[in-house]
Interface confidence: medium
């Protein structure tokens, strides 16, 4: 057991030319608060997946009013740390989401309004008991500077908060086989109390005789890696030798969700869907009112003036869930046609169209040649969402603007010499050859294999190719 602590140092405009406008106008003063969500492991999880390690909401910061004609400075912050208690072992690797929320304090109907200013996320490795780690994250034009650490709650110690410490029984040294508890040199490691054989790397215990597994490990002694390979049993294969899960109680057996929450299994654990008025990993947090700002992503909180009455979050488009915490994946309906890329911006859907297509849903097939001029007498040819030019002789390039070198392909046969000409090329044929490209031999008796040479040209003279 322990606590993850987050210290926000500053929230303000990031470097660069695009300074954001102040989030609090002179007519609508506002104040900031922060929400942190922690998840175990380094997986790229969606923002709306549960905060399995825990979540916390900061206090409100001081009221701020913008200064007209000036960029937004770093904004006044709430006092104190954000603390997320964790009951089990610290996983060592974790993902975080930190949201910066604005509470507008104007005299609008319905009291204060909340809106999400910025959201940053990351994946980090962190040992419990270590020093503060500093971080800078950017979200659009905003920059968030913060520090974080994980610390164990006594008697737990160690990088995962899985070792237990007890005050020394003797003043001078620890008992046989027991080491001092660094950095608490006046305490000793408690005797091993876990189930015999419990893996010291992958298992831990909080009560004598138990063996609880870290993420990715299973089995009675936490010695079996959780396999993602195909297994026969509904919950995975049944043999420890294959490295598969032994069939056993599922994560929802016994319903870990409190306060009437319903449990559903996830690939890695379980998820509780909580009734209104409750939240947390196991629906264990209660007494939430609208004053706590339980509606995320700009949801409007209604009712819930006191802890006994339920609140309702009215979610903005693109969000759902009892706290507007789940983003609706509107791109799953594949609204973009003709191979367009779908972008769910929260407030709107945007389609990024492939070349040659346009429209809100990429539904319009553009005339590729419309407004496309091919220079120097070239003609435009449509095809596959892109135009190309068929260039007149002597020109090349995408728009026929480049003058081609007609001699580059060595068009003159039998050793003929090529000369570039404004209208094409001229071949000066070697003795014994004739023709536009010197392709015809001259017969020894002087007669050619061609019809007679045109007037004014002797066989062997340069032939101009037009």
């Amino acid at each position: 057991a322990g606590v993850f602590e987050l210290q926000i140092h500053s929230f303000g405009p990031g470097p660069g030319p695009g300074a954001p406008r102040s989030p609090c106008s002179a007519r609508l003063p506002c104040r900031l608060f922060f929400r942190v969500c922690l998840k175990p492991g380094l997986s790229e999880e969606a923002a709306e997946s549960p905060c399995a390690l825990g979540a916390a909401l900061s206090a409100r910061g001081p009221v701020y009013t913008e200064q007209p004609g000036a960029p937004a400075p770093d904004l006044p912050l709430p006092d104190g740390l954000l603390q997320v208690p964790f009951r089990d072992a610290w996983p060592g690797t974790f993902s975080f989401i930190i949201e910066t929320w604005r509470e507008e304090l104007g005299d609008q109907i319905g009291g204060p309004a909340w809106s999400l200013l910025a959201r940053v996320a990351g994946r980090r490795r962190l040992a419990a008991g270590g020093p503060w780690a500093r971080d800078i994250q950017r979200a659009g034009a905003w920059e968030l500077r913060f520090s974080y650490r994980a610390r164990c709650e006594p008697p737990a110690v160690g990088t995962a908060c899985t070792r237990l410490c007890r005050p020394r029984s003797a003043p001078s040294r620890c008992g046989p086989g027991l080491r001092p508890c660094a950095p608490l040199e006046d305490e000793c490691e408690a005797p091993l109390v876990c189930r015999a054989g419990c893996s010291p790397e992958h298992g831990f215990c909080e009560q004598p005789g138990e063996c609880r597994c870290l993420e990715g490990w299973t089995g009675p002694l936490c010695t079996v890696p959780v396999s993602t390979s195909s297994c026969l049993s509904p919950r995975g294969p049944s043999s420890a030798t294959t490295g598969c899960l032994v069939p056993g109680p599922g994560p929802c057996d016994g319903n870990p969700c409190a306060n009437g929450g319903s449990c559903s299994e996830t690939p890695r654990s379980f998820e509780c869907t909580c009734p209104r008025g409750f939240y947390g990993l196991r629906c264990e947090v209660s007494g939430v009112t609208c004053a706590d700002g339980p509606c995320f992503n700009g949801g409007l909180c209604v009712g819930g003036a006191d802890p006994d009455s339920a609140y309702i979050c009215h979610c903005p488009p693109g969000f759902q869930g009892s706290n507007c915490e789940k983003r609706v994946d509107r791109c799953s309906l594949q609204p973009c046609r003709n191979g367009g890329l779908c972008l769910d911006l929260g407030h709107a859907l945007r389609c990024r169209c492939r070349a040659g297509f346009a429209g809100p849903r990429c539904e319009h097939d553009l005339d590729d040649c419309a407004g496309r001029a091919c220079a120097n007498g070239g003609t435009c040819v449509e095809g596959g969402g892109a135009h190309r030019c068929s260039c007149a002789l002597g020109f090349g390039g995408r728009d026929c603007r480049e003058r081609a070198d007609p001699c580059a392909a060595r068009p003159c046969a039998h050793g003929g010499r090529c000369y570039a000409h404004f209208s094409g090329l001229v071949c000066a044929c070697a003795p014994g050859y004739m023709g536009a490209r010197c392709e015809f031999p001259v017969h020894p008796d002087g007669a050619s294999a061609l019809p007679a040479a045109p007037p004014g040209l002797r066989p062997g003279d340069p032939q101009r190719y037009l």
Partner: antibody, heavy 124, light 108 residues
Framework: QVTLKESGPGILQPSQTLSLTCSFS??????????IGWIRQPSGTGLEWLAH???????YYNPSLKSRLTISKETSNNQVFLKITNVDTADTASYFC????????????????WGAGTTVTVSS | QIVLTQSPAIMSASPGEKVTLTCSAS???????LYWYQQKPGSSPKLWIY???NLASGVPARFSGSGSGTSYSLIISSMEAEDAASYFC?????????FGAGTKLELK
Amino acid sequence: QVTLKESGPGILQPSQTLSLTCSFSGFSLSTSNTGIGWIRQPSGTGLEWLAHIWWNDDKYYNPSLKSRLTISKETSNNQVFLKITNVDTADTASYFCVQIGRDYSNYAWYFDVWGAGTTVTVSS
Amino acid sequence: QIVLTQSPAIMSASPGEKVTLTCSASSSVSSRYLYWYQQKPGSSPKLWIYSTSNLASGVPARFSGSGSGTSYSLIISSMEAEDAASYFCHQWSNYPLTFGAGTKLELK
């Protein structure tokens, strides 16, 4: 050490355009959150804010003079310019160029370091 | 626009005397964005007090500032000869930015 120095024509006639230059050192207008303003003071009276410009080229003008004012900058030369068109005798004043400072503890901006000023007289 | 009215326009004070200069705004000003400047003849103004009550660098501790809303004050606990100058209040709370007409403080 931050210094600012104003320069101008000294004397000009009504209806002409006044061009002022502020040359500064000790900081750069290419740095985020830096700005320079112009403030004037008719002889023996109060101060009047004219305009200011930020590192990102955001510009703000006094609405009562906006149609006549143009502020601009030359970042590479550490210079800021102010043009006032169609001047009148009422524009006779000392013109100050001022660095905008930042109060981190109060999240506020203010006119911090002032130049010595340049005197402009509009006379026919 | 917000009009800042300073009073008195001119005042004299003896050395050691407590001096209070006032600045009244035509509508509410955020105390965070209320400033005082000192100017001596032939010199440019100097930032003297920022955010209503914070002394600028080099300003003697006998100076203080207070106020909120529409009423602000600059106080000298004990007048000294070097304090003789003009003092201007300034607001950067509303657009356009405005200055008061100033109070000229003379040594008696």
